[in-house]
Amino acid sequence: LTCLGGFASPGPVPPSTALRELIEELVNITQNQKAPLCNGSMVWSINLTAGMYCAALESLINVSGCSAIEKTQRMLSGFCPHKVSAGQFSSLHVRDTKIEVAQFVKDLLLHLKKLFREGQFN
């Protein structure tokens, strides 16, 4: 077989699959957590019913040097239609409470599981 350079582009991941993969990654993080996640870093809590994916990314992107959540950050960047940079907060983001990354991940996971059960893949 001859390699013609590059890889065949995989088909787009259906929203249901993308959501399931994110849930699996968050489960992985919570189950493998030994020491405090991201050294106990604090992030802004978000309204999980309002523009959740971009808001979650805007919060988590401010955590740097934490390999445990890098894959989650990458996945969430694909879930948001606009580019998110550290220090950026959209109008959907209410910055009033900070919580530990571990708690943020647990809250996000519970909400995503609920959405998945209800078949809300949008």
Partner: antibody, heavy 118, light 109 residues
């Protein structure tokens, strides 16, 4: 002033490949996702996909994923859309557009008309 | 894949009010669909009116407003002007891709 200037109209035969460029000015392309939209004559808008020019990461609409390739050159602030295996139903105007939260799809290229005809 | 449906055409009197809706085949539209509304006139590129469900673009007149209404995204035009006659499209984000609506032709008559 923000501007997106696209390459000129193309007339191509079925089976050919087209490459459309979108040269931006007034902003740095790597700071934004660039989206591409198709509009066939007298028809509605159809989202093709988007690219993060900073790392080349792409998302494609299911309809286009096997024939379209989005790329970007951050050194020249230019985004590209390549569509292969052209067929008559690909005859359309193709737009590039900048997307960010505070002005999604606020800036559009002038459109590039691609005509596929034998 | 989801289908996003709009009313094919609507007519409004000058000064009147009309509401355009954007329905998702997969269920209720939410703020995580980041609904966008566009106006397009013949021979022109689309122009964003509303983004993120209910935020007006800087150039959007106050007579246009966006909302969620009965599980659909909605665009309300209050006090229609002759220049508002155009095609209107919505676009919804589905986790990793946009889908545009079928479009609504608004006639001001």
């Amino acid at each position: 002033e923000v501007q997106l200037v696209q390459s000129g109209a193309e007339v191509l035969k079925p089976g050919a490949t087209v490459l459309i460029s979108c040269k931006v000015s007034g902003f740095t392309i790597k700071d934004y996702y660039m989206h591409w939209v198709q509009q066939a004559p007298g028809k509605g808008l159809e989202w093709i996909g988007r690219i993060d020019p900073e790392d080349g990461e792409t998302k494609y609409a299911p309809k286009f994923h096997d024939r379209v390739t989005l790329t970007a050159d951050t050194s020249t602030d230019t985004a590209y859309m390549e569509l292969s295996s052209l067929r008559s139903e690909d005859t359309a105007v193709y737009y590039c557009t900048r997307y960010d939260y505070y002005g999604p799809f606020a800036y559009w290229g002038q459109g590039t008309l691609v005509t596929v005809s034998s | 894949q989801a289908v996003v449906t709009q009313e094919p055409s609507l007519t409004v009197s000058p000064g009147g009010t009309v509401t355009l809706t954007c329905r998702s085949s997969t269920g209720a539209v939410t703020t995580s669909n980041y609904a966008n509304w566009f106006q397009q006139k013949p021979g022109q590129a689309p122009r964003t009116l509303i983004y993120g469900t209910n935020n007006r673009a800087p150039w959007t007149p106050a007579r246009f407003s966006g909302s969620l209404l009965g599980g659909k995204a909605a665009l309300t035009l209050s006090g229609a002007q002759p220049e508002d006659e155009a095609e209107y499209y919505c676009a919804l984000w589905y986790i990793n891709h946009f889908i545009f609506g079928t479009g609504t032709k608004v006639t001001v008559l």
